[in-house]
Interface confidence: low
Amino acid sequence: EAHKSEIAHRFKDLGEQHFKGLVLIAFSQYLQKCPYEEHIKLVQEVTDFAKTCVADENAENCDKSIHTLFGDKLCAIPKLRDNYGELADCCAKQEPERNECFLQHKDDNPNLPPFQRPEAEAMCTSFQENPTSFLGHYLHEVARRHPYFYAPELLYYAEKYNEVLTQCCTESDKAACLTPKLDAVKEKALVAAVRQRMKCSSMQRFGERAFKAWAVARMSQRFPNAEFAEITKLATDVTKINKECCHGDLLECADDRAELAKYMCENQATISSKLQACCDKPVLQKSQCLAEIEHDNIPADLPSIAADFVEDKEVCKNYAEAKDVFLGTFLYEYSRRHPDYSVSLLLRLAKKYEATLEKCCAEGDPPACYGTVLAEFQPLVEEPKNLVKTNCELYEKLGEYGFQNAVLVRYTQKAPQVSTPTLVEAARNLGRVGTKCCTLPEAQRLPCVEDYLSAILNRLCVLHEKTPVSEKVTKCCSGSLVERRPCFSALTVDETYVPKEFKAETFTFHSDICTLPDKEKQIKKQTALAELVKHKPKATEDQLKTVMGDFAQFVDKCCKAADKDNCFATEGPNLVARSKEALA
C-alpha cells in the first residue's frame, strides 16, 4: 500500500528509538570515516524532519523517497570531497544512481583502528552517565567497520550490550562480569557480520534467484512440516528483506523483518511447532529468535524422494512446464529430509539434478538417463563429509591455535601472493571453525562447518577483489558461490610463485611483544609463520614446527629476561640465522 510520506510511515511503524538507531547505522555504513558527533547531528535532523511529516504528511519534502532524503543529507556535509575523495562524485547523480554509487563506495576493509573495548570501570561510568550516547557509539563503531552488517540484527546486539552493562555495572568485580559476556556478544556479532556479507555478495553477484534458492533450502531444513507454498512465501519475504538491507534501505528492511516475524507467529500451525517461545518475545528478540530457531521434527511418513523426481514418468514434462517451480520443489523435498547437510551442499545437489535433467530430457530415453541421478550425488556428499572428518580430527589433535596455524600454512601455500594480514585474518577465522563446529553432535557438524567456511571465504574474496593478486583466488572467487569452498579446498601449492627473499627485519622482534594481550601475540607469531611460508613455500611441516618452536622459546625467554631489550637485540639475530639454516 502506498503512503504519502514514506519517512512518516517508517517512523510510525518502527518507533523513535529504532528509527534513530537505523538512521545512525545507515549513515555510519555509507560514510565510514565521519566521527560519531557528526552522524548523530544528522540523525537528529532526520528524526526531527520525520516527526514533522508524521504531524503533517503534506508538509514540504515529506513525499520524497528515503534515499533522496538521506542522500541529500550526506551530500550536504561540508568537506565531503576532502574526506571521501571520489565518493563526492556520487552527489552529482540523481536517484537511484546516486544510492548505487554510495553502495559501490562502501569499504569492506576501512582504514580504522581495531575497536578497543574501554576498561570496565570507564565503560560503566560512561554507560551510566548516558546510556543512549554509549549505545549510539556502539552502533556507529560496528556499522562503520562492517558496512553490510544486517541493521535490525545490529540493533539486537546493541540491546544485548545494554543488558550486559545494566547487569554487570552494579557488580563489585565489573570486569569479571563484563569480559566473558561481552566477548560472547562480540563473537556472535562478528560471525553475523561475515554471514550477512555473504548474503549481500550473493545478492550483488548472482541476483535474487540465487538468494531465494538459498532461502528455500534453509527454510525447508528448519520447517520440514511446512508446505512448499509456505516455504516459497517465507523465502520470497526473506529475499526481499535482505535485498533491502544490502541495498541500504534499512528502515524498510527492519519494518519488513518485523512484519515477517508477526506473520510467522500468526501462522505457526502451518510453519513449525517450535516457534511459540520466540513469539512471546519483544520485536527485536522475536526476529532474532526466529532466525536462530531449531529445526522442527521431520515428518515421519515422508516418501522416498525418488518417487516424484526419478521414478515418475512425467519428470521431463513437469520440468519443462515450470522449471523453477519443479526445481524448487526438488530443493524443498531434498532439504527438508536433510537438516544434516549444508545449504551449499543442497544447492550443489539441486544444480547437479538440474544439469542431469537438461541433458537427459533432450535424449531418446530420458528415464534411463536420469535414473541414476541420486547415486551420482554420492561423491558430492562424500567430499564435504571427508573435509569435516579430517579437519575436526586435526582440530582435536592441535587445539584452536595449532589448527589456525595449520590452516595458515595451507592457505599461504595456496595463495602466497595475498597480503599477510589478509591471510592471517582468514586463517584465524577459518581456524575458529573447529571450536564453533567440531564439538557439535555429528548431525550438525557438516552444515556448521561448510556454511561457516563459505562465509569466511567470501570475506577473503571481497578483500581480494579490492586488490587482486592471485589468479587462483580470482578463479575460485569468480565462480558460483556454492562451488567456492570446494574450489579453495582443491587448491594446491602455487607452483608459479617466486619465493620471497628472506628479510631479517620481518623476523626481528622487540620487547613490546611481551606486553601484548595473548590474541595480539598470536597474531605476531602467525604473521611470522606466513612470512616463513612465503619465503619457503615447500617447507615441510617438521621444518616449520622447528622454526616456530624455536621462535616461541625465544619470545618466552626474552620476555622473562631482566633486560628484555638486550635479550631481543642479541638473541634475535641468532634466531634468524638458525631459522635460515633450518629452512635451507
Epitope: 508446505e227 512448499f228 507454498a229 509456505e230 516459497t232 512465501k233 520470497t236 501462522n267 500451525a269 502451518t270
Partner: nanobody
Framework: EVQLLESGGGLVQPGGSLRLSCAAS????????VAWFRQAPGKEREFVAG????????YYADSVKGRFTISRDNSKNTLYLQMNSLRPEDTAVYYC???????????????????WGQGTLVTVSS
C-alpha cells in the same frame, strides 16, 4: 471483509466434467490465497486445491491431481475449479475459501481460512 459466492454445481455422470466458479468481492482475489474444499455427507471437510496470493503456485490433493485444475481470473475477481474425469467419490458440497494477506499462500488447514462461501453441490452419479 471478503464475500464469496460459488456456482456451477450440479448432477453429472461419471467421467463427465464440471466447472465451478467463485466470485469474490470486498478484496482483490490476486492478493488472497484461495482454495476449494469439499465435504461429503457424514465426512470431514477436505482440501481439494489451492492457489497462492501473490505467489502463483497451485496445490492439489493427491486424490484430484491430474483431473482437477484450479485457476483465477484477476480481471473478473473470480476463482475457478475445472473438474474432469469425475468419479462418484467426488460427490460433495464444494466450498470456496479465502485467506487474505501480503501475499498469503495456500494451506490445507481449513481452520486457517477466515472467509467461506455457502457451498455448491456436485453429484456424480449414473
Amino acid at each position: 471483509e471478503v464475500q464469496l459466492l460459488e456456482s456451477g454445481g450440479g448432477l453429472v455422470q461419471p467421467g463427465g466434467s464440471l466447472r465451478l466458479s467463485c466470485a469474490a468481492s470486498g478484496r482483490y482475489i490476486d492478493e488472497t490465497a484461495v482454495a476449494w474444499f469439499r465435504q461429503a455427507p457424514g465426512k470431514e471437510r477436505e482440501f481439494v486445491a489451492g492457489i497462492g496470493g501473490g505467489v502463483d503456485i497451485t496445490y492439489y490433493a493427491d486424490s484430484v491431481k491430474g483431473r482437477f485444475t484450479i485457476s483465477r481470473d484477476n480481471s473478473k475477481n473470480t476463482l475457478y475449479l475445472q473438474m474432469n474425469s469425475l468419479r462418484p467419490e467426488d460427490t460433495a458440497v464444494y466450498y470456496c475459501a479465502a485467506r487474505p494477506g501480503k501475499p498469503l499462500i495456500t494451506s490445507k488447514v481449513a481452520d486457517l481460512y477466515p472467509y467461506w462461501g455457502q457451498g455448491t453441490l456436485v453429484t456424480v452419479s449414473s
